[in-house]
Interface confidence: medium
Amino acid sequence: QLPPGKPEIFKCRSPNKETFTCWWRPGTDGGLPTNYSLTYHREGETLMHECPDYITGGPNSCHFGKQYTSMWRTYIMMVNATNQMGSSFSDELYVDVTYIV
């Protein structure tokens, strides 16, 4: 039994520039149940926010509804994988809604 492997945010999509969704690939689970959470901050802010909607985009996803989506901001996000043995973090991903399709 091991801590989880490093997850990877591999795709973000914004079909209408009003909402967007990002998906991650889990790393190895270490042989234990693993919880995933996506956190993000915006521009130069230090305040961290948790994913507002883990449901809409399906498994291993975070959906940002209209009220959370701004074409004026860069989102810096990462995924945390946690099991009883420890945690691991994805690399940070910088997302500008204007430039994702």
């Epitope: 521009e43 305040l47 009220q67 901001r73 860069t74």
Partner: antibody, heavy 115, light 111 residues
């Protein structure tokens, strides 16, 4: 320490032009969208314009569309507002503000449009 | 006419609690956009007081608090002090204007 310093205000005749500058220091300017907000004498705050972190997107309040142009030079850490066809109702103190929430503001520069 | 509606004035005595309201519409506050509050002391530039409805930037006393519900928001100041005498503005993003909108401002007088 975050600092925003506006300049370029002054007295101009109706129909004239001015270019305002906002020099930024103490933070990574290119990470932030920037606003211009104005305040007419004795009145409240009025949002004027917004530019994205990379300069690729801009937005304006209706009353200045086609007359004002917001721009930025990230290599110089400077925000600009080019104001053409100025009207008496554009008379105000013009502030630049950092980020979508306006967490830091400059001290303002006064623009007076009068004949 | 401001897009967000605030009372033009409010007042209280030292130590009191005062509340300032900010009413918007379905294209701004009611669309789920965060409300921010700014304090403008006489002769100075505005300063961010509350952001994202209820969060205080570092250095802002916990006497200041914000809340939001539906198409309205409010700013509460408890333990009122003479140095709180200022103009207070709410602001939010507006979908239909694709920009910021402000309230008309509330002049707070400490009696």
């Amino acid at each position: 320490e975050v600092q925003l310093l506006e300049s370029g205000g002054g007295l101009v005749q109706p129909g004239g032009s001015l270019r305002l500058s906002c020099a930024a220091s103490g933070f990574t300017f290119s990470n932030y969208g920037m606003h211009w907000v104005r305040q007419a004498p004795g009145k409240g705050l009025e949002w004027v314009s917004l530019i994205s972190w990379d300069g690729g997107r801009t937005s304006y309040t209706d009353s200045v569309k086609g007359r004002f142009t917001i721009s930025r030079d990230n290599s110089k850490n400077t925000l600009y507002l080019q104001m053409n066809s100025l009207r008496a109702e554009d008379t105000a103190v013009y502030y630049c503000a950092r980020g979508l929430i306006g967490d830091n503001w400059g001290q303002g520069t006064l623009v007076t449009v009068s004949s | 006419q401001s897009v967000l509606t605030q009372p033009p004035s409010a007042s209280g005595t030292p130590g009191q609690r005062v509340t300032i309201s900010c009413t918007g519409s379905s294209s701004n506050i009611g669309a789920g956009y965060d409300v921010h509050w700014y304090q403008q002391l006489p002769g100075t530039a505005p300063k961010l007081l509350i952001y994202d409805n209820n969060k205080r930037p570092s250095g802002v006393p916990d006497r200041f608090s914000g809340s939001k519900s539906g198409t309205s928001a409010s700013l509460a100041i408890s333990g009122l002090r003479s140095e709180d005498e200022a103009d207070y503005y709410c602001a939010a993003w507006d979908d239909s204007l694709n920009g910021w909108v402000f309230g008309g401002g509330t002049k707070l007088t400490v009696l």
